[in-house]
């Protein structure tokens, strides 16, 4: 807190301008009127106040708006946003995408801070859902944003917003998140033709069920190994050798390098060795010829 001291003669600020950067903290406190600051917030970001000077300006706004800043002030906070705590931000009602963009710009190039996370949370809750424009904006600033959401939060993403998602936006998503996103992507891209559909759906396939993988295997998609390795193990296990061969196309040779890793390892254990031998890759660990395979899970389900 800056001590309350009288403003020196001739130093009372009549407008927010560059001369104020030479004011000491106590002079800013004494000589800058909070109402003037609020009405001229658009000028603050054009003036290179230091981090310590911003403390004083924030203190003034806090006194003027104890219940939270109006959006007219918020949209012009600029670097002052860096001074806000999550508690401050929870008092705000941010409805404009332009305001959100302006504040995200200040934090550009940095990790998502607790302040930014709180701001986004307030904004999305205020909108009721994560619409395409918002998602476009958020993933542009934070490619990992989608994967920071819980499956419950992701359920509010409308399928139309999926068009905004780029492959790199899903890099850090776990299977639970992809389970939620995949059906939305399938719906969003359903009217595309085979090859175009596969290009769009590919990064979501970590949430695909067996029947969809079987269907893809009939479409000459030539899935790369990196995508295959991200598939759900439970979705890959029921695929036959022939289906995996069709699914991977020329990339099938890559199975050898991955034979000790999931899901390839587990899939090999479920295949007949003589079926695996037809691939000519030297994959080992399949069910020896002459052995009978009982699917106990199916038996339990029937009983």
């Amino acid at each position: 807190e800056v001590e309350k001291t009288a403003c020196p003669s001739g130093k009372k600020a009549r407008e927010i301008d560059e001369s104020l950067i030479f004011y000491k903290k106590w002079e800013l406190e004494a000589c800058v009127d909070a109402a003037l600051l609020a009405t001229q917030m658009d000028r603050v970001n054009a003036i290179p106040f230091t981090y310590e000077q911003l403390d004083v300006l924030k203190h003034k706004l806090d006194e003027l708006y104890p219940q939270g800043y109006p959006e007219s002030v918020i949209q012009h906070l600029g670097y002052l946003f860096l001074k806000m705590s999550p508690e401050d931000i929870r008092k705000w009602n941010v409805t404009s995408l332009e305001t959100l963009k302006a504040l995200l710009e200040v934090n550009k190039g940095h990790e998502m801070s607790p302040q930014v996370a709180t701001l986004i949370d307030r904004f999305v809750k205020g909108r009721g859902q994560l619409d395409k424009d918002t998602l476009d904006t958020l993933t542009a600033f934070y490619p990992g944003y989608l994967c920071s959401l819980s499956p419950e939060e992701l359920s509010s993403v409308p399928p139309s917003s999926i068009w905004a998602v780029r492959p790199q936006d899903l890099d850090t998503c776990d299977p639970r998140q992809l389970d939620v996103l995949y059906p939305k992507a399938r719906l969003a891209f359903q009217n595309m033709n085979g090859s175009e559909y596969f290009v769009k759906i590919q990064s979501f396939l970590g949430g695909a069920p067996t029947e969809d993988l079987k269907a893809l295997s009939q479409q000459n998609v030539s899935m790369d190994l990196a995508t295959f390795m991200k598939l759900r193990t439970d979705a890959v296990l029921p695929l036959t050798v022939a289906e995996v061969q069709k699914l991977l196309g020329p990339h099938v040779e890559g199975l050898k390098a991955e034979e000790r890793h999931r899901p390839v390892r587990d899939w090999i254990l479920r295949q007949r060795q003589d079926d695996l031998d037809t691939l000519g890759l030297g994959l080992q660990g399949g069910i020896p010829n002459g052995y009978l395979v009982l699917d106990l899970s199916m038996q339990e389900a029937l009983s």
């Epitope: 560059e18 950067i21 054009a46 290179p48 230091t50 981090y51 310590e52 670097y79 860096l82």
Partner: antibody, heavy 120, light 107 residues
Framework: QVQLVQSGAEVKKPGASVKVSCKAS????????MHWVRQAPGQGLEWMGM????????IYYEKFQGRVTMTVDKSISTAYMELSRLRSDDTAVYYC?????????????WGQGTLVTVSS | DIVMTQSPDSLAVSLGERATINCKAS??????VAWYQQKPGQSPKLLIY???TRHTGVPDRFTGSGSGTDFTLTISSLQAEDVAVYFC?????????FGAGTKLEIK
């Protein structure tokens, strides 16, 4: 990478003016305040002022007010610092420098410096 | 204006030994202090900011500490390439001001 390339050394007579240039590359010229700092022989560093290339806003340290003029030419990403009514104690190396985050005014990148000698 | 007083003016330290440079501000500047290294014939290079945060690529033998009015730059094990003049700078308020510099040499 960010580069600030300054003009060559100058020798001036007392009372004359000098104009030093600083050509920027490797970043968006209009994004950051350009500062000027000088260093007299064997002395410390002294901040002179700054200019924002996008708005042409200038802020001068009052010690140099009335004698210094900072300008930019956006078309060639170049900043200029002109100091008039030169005195012998203006003999110094003049540096341009940029600050990436204005609220944290530490000097992230510097030009190589321009030696200005004021001598009769 | 905030005056930054550096000490000592010069310092001679043996290779591998610790070097300590001090800087005192005339008013509290919080942790708004940066340190620069200037080798002969070169422009200054940023080493430390926020009093203790190392700039990208700066070796971890350089350590900054302090807050308020007293600040220290420490080089834990002096290397030949550390011979230079070191400056502190406050950025709590304008005008930005620097210390007069400490010349570091090898004993």
């Amino acid at each position: 990478q960010v580069q600030l390339v300054q003009s060559g050394a100058e020798v001036k007579k007392p009372g004359a003016s000098v104009k030093v240039s600083c050509k920027a590359s490797g970043y968006t010229f209009t994004s950051y305040w350009m500062h000027w700092v000088r260093q007299a022989p064997g002395q410390g560093l002294e901040w002179m002022g700054m200019i924002h290339p996008n708005s042409d806003n200038t802020i001068y340290y009052e010690k140099f007010q009335g004698r210094v003029t900072m300008t930019v030419d956006k078309s060639i990403s170049t900043a200029y610092m002109e100091l008039s009514r030169l005195r012998s104690d203006d003999t110094a190396v003049y540096y341009c420098a940029i600050i990436i985050t204005p609220v944290v005014p530490k000097f992230d990148y510097w030009g190589q410096g321009t030696l200005v000698t004021v001598s009769s | 204006d905030i005056v930054m007083t550096q000490s000592p003016d010069s310092l001679a330290v043996s290779l591998g030994e610790r070097a300590t440079i001090n800087c005192k501000a005339s008013h509290s500047v919080g942790t708004s202090v940066a340190w620069y290294q200037q080798k002969p014939g070169q422009s200054p290079k940023l080493l430390i900011y926020w009093a203790s945060t190392r700039h990208t690529g700066v070796p971890d033998r350089f350590t900054g500490s302090g807050s308020g009015t007293d600040f220290t730059l420490t080089i834990s094990s002096l290397q030949a390439e550390d011979v230079a003049v070191y400056f502190c700078q406050q950025y709590s308020s304008y005008p930005l001001t620097f210390g007069a510099g400490t010349k570091l040499e090898i004993k």
